[in-house]
Interface confidence: medium
């Protein structure tokens, strides 16, 4: 049987096949993919802008940031208000004070420790 390079198309991930000769073809890949048949998802994480210890997770022609618990937002630049998330973070009447990348407790009546429990 006659071999036709682009029938069926060997290009994957939405790539477009173009016949370049009797037995040769070329794949034009969609943004985010590379390789002779567009088989590879390009790693978009080099020069990522995840901040505050965020980890870059590659996508297709984009990436996302996986943030540590104290940070949120697209690039982990927004502080999580632990005092709102944990109303009882401070014990024994202590006042919760949100800080960039964490929180602290202001203790009263002789109590001490990170959560005023000592």
């Amino acid at each position: 049987s006659l071999y036709v390079p682009c029938a069926p198309s060997p290009c994957v991930n939405g790539g477009t096949c173009r016949q370049t000769g009797d037995f040769t073809f070329e794949c034009n890949c969609l943004p985010g993919f590379e390789g002779s048949t567009c088989e590879r998802n390009i790693d978009d994480c080099p020069n990522h802008r995840c901040q505050n210890g965020g980890v870059c997770v590659d996508g297709v022609n984009t990436y996302n940031c996986r943030c540590p618990p104290q940070w949120t937002g697209q690039f982990c630049t927004e502080d999580v208000d632990e005092c709102l998330l944990q109303p009882n973070a401070c014990q024994n009447g202590g006042t919760c004070a949100n800080r960039n990348g964490g929180y602290g407790c202001v203790c009263v009546n002789g109590w001490s420790g990170d959560d005023c429990s000592e």
């Epitope: 943004p31 590379e34 390009i42 790693d43 978009d44 080099p46 020069n47 802008r49 901040q51 022609n61 984009t62 990436y63 697209q74 690039f75 630049t77």
Partner: antibody, heavy 117, light 112 residues
Framework: SVEESGGRLVTPGTPLTLTCTVS????????MSWVRQAPGKGLEWIGI??????TLFYASWAKGRFTISKTSTTVDLKITSPTTEDTATYFC??????????????WGPGTLVTVSS | AQVLTQTASSVSAAVGGTVTINCQAS???????LAWYQQKPGQPPKLLMY???TLESGVSSRFKGSGSGTQFTLTISGVQCDDAATYYC?????????????FGGGTKVEIK
């Protein structure tokens, strides 16, 4: 679209701020770079302000000589102490992919800065 | 600082001919994020190609980009008078190791 303004004749040492005004897209999504071109010379990248993180990066030769800042619709380039070598057309250019530096697919017409005593 | 070298500062071609412009990087371009621009006098640069080989929307398929790593090429086939311009390569590099972006010195294409 993007359009530069503020270019004029200045004497050496006189600080000058150029403004790039954008419309039709958000500066919170796209990186913006400044590029210059001296008369009859090639393109020279000055620096970038990144979308989202607002991180600034400058070309090694440009550090301390230029300052980039932005508002919601403008990107400024301050030439801190111009010298005659800073005579050039200054272009504002938008990154072509959201949150990736990559390439520049939208350029302003440029604004001419002439530094002379 | 990262450097992009365009070996020829000018090239000449006949109408209908082929022009090849080379661009060499001093270190690897991030993910082949290498672009080509066309600039005519008094105008800003116009994006032709990005990602080393992806044609920008609306640009003639006579323009073809190839290469990877540190060696890249722009080929113009079936050269037309309108192709007379200066062509620049531009690459993205790791910001952590120096300049994020660099341009080549440009190659002027003249039509015979």
């Amino acid at each position: 679209s993007v359009e530069e303004s503020g270019g004029r004749l200045v004497t050496p040492g006189t600080p000058l701020t150029l403004t790039c005004t954008v419309s039709g897209f958000s500066l919170s999504s796209y990186d913006m770079s400044w590029v210059r071109q001296a008369p009859g010379k090639g393109l020279e990248w000055i620096g970038i302000i990144q979308a989202g993180s607002n991180t600034l990066f400058y070309a090694s030769w440009a550090k301390g000589r230029f300052t980039i800042s932005k508002t919601s619709t403008t990107v400024d380039l301050k030439i801190t102490s111009p010298t005659t070598e800073d005579t050039a057309t200054y272009f504002c250019a938008r990154g072509g992919v959201i949150f990736i530096i990559g390439h520049f697919n939208l350029w302003g017409p440029g604004t001419l800065v002439t530094v002379s005593s | 600082a990262q450097v992009l070298t365009q070996t020829a500062s000018s090239v000449s071609a006949a109408v209908g001919g082929t022009v090849t412009i080379n661009c060499q990087a001093s270190q690897s371009v991030v993910n082949n994020r290498l672009a080509w621009y066309q600039q005519k006098p008094g105008q800003p640069p116009k994006l032709l190609m990005y990602g080393a080989s992806t044609l920008e929307s609306g640009v003639s398929s006579r323009f073809k980009g190839s290469g990877s790593g540190t060696q890249f090429t722009l080929t113009i086939s079936g050269v037309q008078c309108d192709d007379a311009a200066t062509y620049y390569c531009q690459g993205e590099f790791l910001c952590s190791s120096g300049d994020c972006v660099a341009f080549g010195g440009g190659t002027k294409v003249e039509i015979k």
